[in-house]
């Protein structure tokens, strides 16, 4: 093993980490779990503990980024450099960055969670054997109802374990049809559709009607994404494999390497490659986020690369399902932090539960009862010509959290985000929010749980704004944005989808700027944002101090309240009023005392 010069290390043992944003390659819960397990490798052999927090002053900030992403070490596109980490220390030191141009998996292909079947929601196992053939994506083979399924073990023929893959024929997400499956064909604007479509939408999300006639019933849902068959490269990147497809007159119901000399798997994205010539590469095994994270966290704790090829800290990625830590890794980390004080826990013994009823040879259909829980995240209804979102929710039945001193908004030093929603001021902090209406003797109401009202959101928000016309709520956290229309949500989406470059680490605020337009802020910069198109005008980039002279340059939140702009720094705000095109600071005050009218005791 090697350590950094001078045995660079953390000088406290309770290390905190913040997952600033996410990759879209894996479900959030899987990412959270991969990072937690990676930290657990190191805490199992040292006195270190790792606690997840939701603020940027964490010791280890974890970020997904592409190319230039805000440090001096740009990523390099797919493959090559997978991630990087800084050695222990303040600021960016200790942080770990992951290249989101990689396909992140658990090392064995895309992670596709299943529903129904007999595998209790286990993820697909790619490749898997069915009737002697190998499948690297979900398939409809062996079924007459067109539902895609997969084996959750390497061999369906011997193990009989399966589940259904995300499919619009099984369920839809969000929309206004309570998750009902698509109805094909369906009528939209007088035209017949026999597959999901993006027509009527500007955001590229695929949707369908859940009755035979959208024009009449206005019921719709969003089609689940199929990570297992979303192609890369070729001439159809981002589109789905179509199975079966015809290639050189022969039919293929799984990805194939036929016609290639390099063995790479590909598929057609229409039913006939011979006539349409549309194709892309099938997802590869991807890189294990768990293993790469474990290696990067080794760096973040003070370990340099090892010269032992079997060690986790060896500088080359190698997928393994065995215990990742080598004796050399353990020696290295203990050289820095010492051994774990108490005896190392023995792994629990587990028994594999047996299915209660013997499954049939071929996957059976899903139960008739659909799952009661709706997905919490997903896009809202298509704008303009397309289906509209459901009506906005009525009075919320938000849970009030048991009160403690910190739950009084007046005791909050710095709020994560503040926004005027409706005619009330909403103040967000660490998974909670308060509501405030101006008036003599009025006090903030709450706290309420963000998760109750907006379940898709993370605990830590950077900024929030409401677009008055559409009543859309925009929530920003790290490099991601969620857009709520009533109870339905679009997102999370990456900031690049709004036209903000990889150098924009977060959106720190927003102000109205004319009909359907906003100003988005990030640190010292701002952009004009078209709410309908959900896109910034890249030519509109400007420096904050040019447009708003006199406000601090390191504001952490910008919001609009009572037609004035507020720039927050620490516990203070700078209020800006606009008179005859001039923006002037007309007040500096405390958020708590001067806006929330808290008593100064």
């Amino acid at each position: 093993f090697q350590t950094f010069e001078g045995d660079l290390k953390w000088h406290h043992h309770n290390i905190t980490y913040w997952i600033q944003n996410y990759s879209e390659d894996l479900p959030r819960a899987v990412i959270d779990d991969a990072f937690a397990r990676a930290f657990a490798l190191w805490s199992a052999v040292t006195p270190l503990t790792f606690t997840r927090v939701y603020s940027r002053d964490a010791d280890i900030v974890i970020q997904f980024g592409v190319a230039e992403h805000g440090d001096g070490y740009p990523f390099d596109g797919k493959d090559g450099l997978l991630a990087h980490a800084f050695p222990p220390g303040p600021g960016i030191q200790g942080d770990a960055h992951f290249d989101d141009d990689e396909l992140w998996s658990l090392g064995k292909g895309v992670v596709v969670p299943t529903r129904f079947g007999n595998a209790d929601g286990a993820a697909c196992h790619f490749p898997f054997i069915f009737e002697g053939r190998s499948y690297s994506a979900c398939t409809t083979d062996g079924r007459s109802d067109g539902l895609p399924w997969c084996s959750t073990t390497a061999n369906y023929d011997t193990d009989d374990r399966f589940g259904f893959c995300p499919s619009e024929r099984l369920y839809t997400q969000d929309g206004n049809a309570d998750g009902k499956p698509c109805q094909f064909p369906f009528i939209f604007q007088g035209q017949s559709y026999s597959a999901c479509t993006t027509d009527g939408r500007s955001d590229g999300y695929r949707w369908c009607a859940t009755t035979a006639n959208y024009d009449r019933d206005k019921l719709f849902g969003f089609c689940p994404t199929r990570a297992d068959s979303t192609v890369m490269g070729g001439n159809s990147a981002g589109e789905l494999c179509v199975f079966p497809f015809t290639f050189l007159g022969k039919e293929y119901s799984t990805c194939t390497s036929e016609g290639r000399g390099d063995g790479r798997l590909w598929c057609a994205t229409t039913s006939n490659f011979d006539s349409d010539k549309k194709w892309g590469f099938c997802p590869d095994q991807g890189y294990s986020l768990f293993l790469v994270a474990a290696h990067e966290f080794g760096h973040a704790l003070g370990l340099d690369h090892s010269s032992v090829p079997e060690a986790l800290m060896y500088p080359m990625y190698r997928f393994t399902e065995g215990p990742p830590l080598h004796k050399d890794d353990v020696n290295g980390i203990r050289h820095l932090y010492g051994p774990r004080p108490e005896p190392e826990p023995r792994p629990p013994t587990t028994t594999t539960p047996q299915p209660t009823a013997p499954p049939t040879v071929c996957p059976t259909g899903p139960p008739t009862v659909h799952p009661s829980e709706r997905p919490t995240a997903g896009p809202t209804g298509p704008p303009s010509a397309g289906p509209t979102g459901p009506p906005t929710a009525g009075p919320s039945t938000a849970t009030t959290v048991p009160l403690s001193p910190v739950d009084d908004a007046c005791n909050v030093n710095i709020f994560d985000a503040i926004a005027e929603i409706g005619n009330q001021l909403y103040l967000f902090k660490d998974g909670k929010y308060w509501r405030f209406s101006e008036g003599r003797g009025s006090r903030p109401q709450g706290p309420f749980l963000i998760a109750d009202k907006w379940p898709a959101l993370p605990r830590k928000l950077d900024s929030v704004f409401e677009e008055r016309l559409s009543k859309k709520l925009f929530f920003f956290s790290g490099r991601q944005v969620w857009v709520y229309t009533g109870a339905s949500v679009l997102g999370p989406r990456r900031l690049d989808k709004l036209g903000l470059g990889a150098d924009v680490a977060q959106v720190t605020g927003a102000l109205r700027s004319g009909r359907g337009k906003m100003l988005l802020f990030s640190g010292r910069r701002l952009w004009r944002f078209d709410v309908k198109a959900q896109m910034v005008d890249p030519r509109s980039a400007s420096e904050v101090d040019r447009m708003f002279p006199g406000v601090p340059l390191d504001t952490h939140d910008v919001f609009q309240y009572r037609e004035k702009a507020y720039f927050c720094q620490d516990r203070f705000y700078w209020r800006v009023s606009s008179r005859s095109e001039l923006n002037q600071v007309d007040q500096v005050g405390y958020v708590t005392y001067d806006i929330l009218q808290c008593p100064e005791d």
Partner: antibody, heavy 124, light 107 residues
């Protein structure tokens, strides 16, 4: 002992081309990012280009983008800089330099070994 | 791009004296700063990396300090071989940039 040896410099007319090479020895070449840095006569240092260890990523200073191409042959432990459409302002001593850090550990900022430099003169 | 400003442009000191060279970044670069020494007709030589770590073979009279935007290279007692041009270089943000250099000359 680590050594970097540049070659390929010389006098060339504006609009012309030149290919610089840098032969490396004494370290595991394929593990390290490699850089070209130049210095105009009597002036300071200016980075030109970098290529990552795998050769999978290359980056260029705005002043040379679209005209220069960096490449490497890890089997030959050699770094290259193909310079096309040369201009008078490209006149400089060109150094190849080895990054002190490697791979995914991004702390040790600095170029710990430099070649002796090769002079490129662009003049008619 | 981040601008690196070195001061003074020229520093005239006698052998045995203490030399203090300054480098300022136009925005915070954490500790991602290196110092190089260059003598006439020679390639630059790495002295300090990550603001304060001495490179292999560099005498203890050379030390670096600072973080954020302000950095200092100190030569505690000048030797005749120390007279040269000194450059700072940042990698706190992309792309990397160099300072314009400080010439250290014999008084």
């Amino acid at each position: 002992e680590v050594q970097l040896l540049e070659s390929g410099g010389g006098l060339v007319q504006p609009g012309g081309s030149l290919r610089l090479s840098c032969a490396a020895s004494g370290f595991t070449f394929s593990w390290y990012d490699m850089w070209w840095v130049r210095q105009a006569p009597g002036k300071g240092l200016e980075w030109v280009s970098v290529i990552y260890s795998s050769g999978g990523a290359t980056f260029y200073a705005d002043s040379v983008k679209g005209r220069f191409t960096i490449s490497r042959d890890n089997s030959k432990n050699t770094l290259y800089l193909q310079m096309n459409s040369l201009r008078a302002e490209d006149t400089a001593v060109y150094y190849c330099a080895k990054d002190r850090a490697y791979g995914d550990y991004v702390g040790w900022n600095g170029f710990d070994y430099w070649g002796q430099g090769t002079l490129v003169t662009v003049s008619s | 791009d981040i601008q690196m400003t070195q001061s003074p442009a020229t520093l005239s000191l006698s052998p045995g004296e203490r030399a203090t060279l300054s480098c300022r970044a136009s925005q915070s670069i954490s500790s991602f700063l290196a110092w190089y020494q260059q003598k006439p007709g020679q390639a630059p030589r790495l002295l300090i990396y990550d603001a304060s770590y001495r490179a292999t073979g560099i005498p203890a009279r050379f030390s670096g300090s600072g973080s954020g935007t302000d950095f200092t290279l100190t030569i505690s007692s000048l030797e005749p071989e120390d007279y040269a041009v000194y450059y700072c270089q940042q990698r706190g943000n992309w792309p990397i940039t160099f300072g314009q250099g400080t010439r250290l000359e014999i008084k």
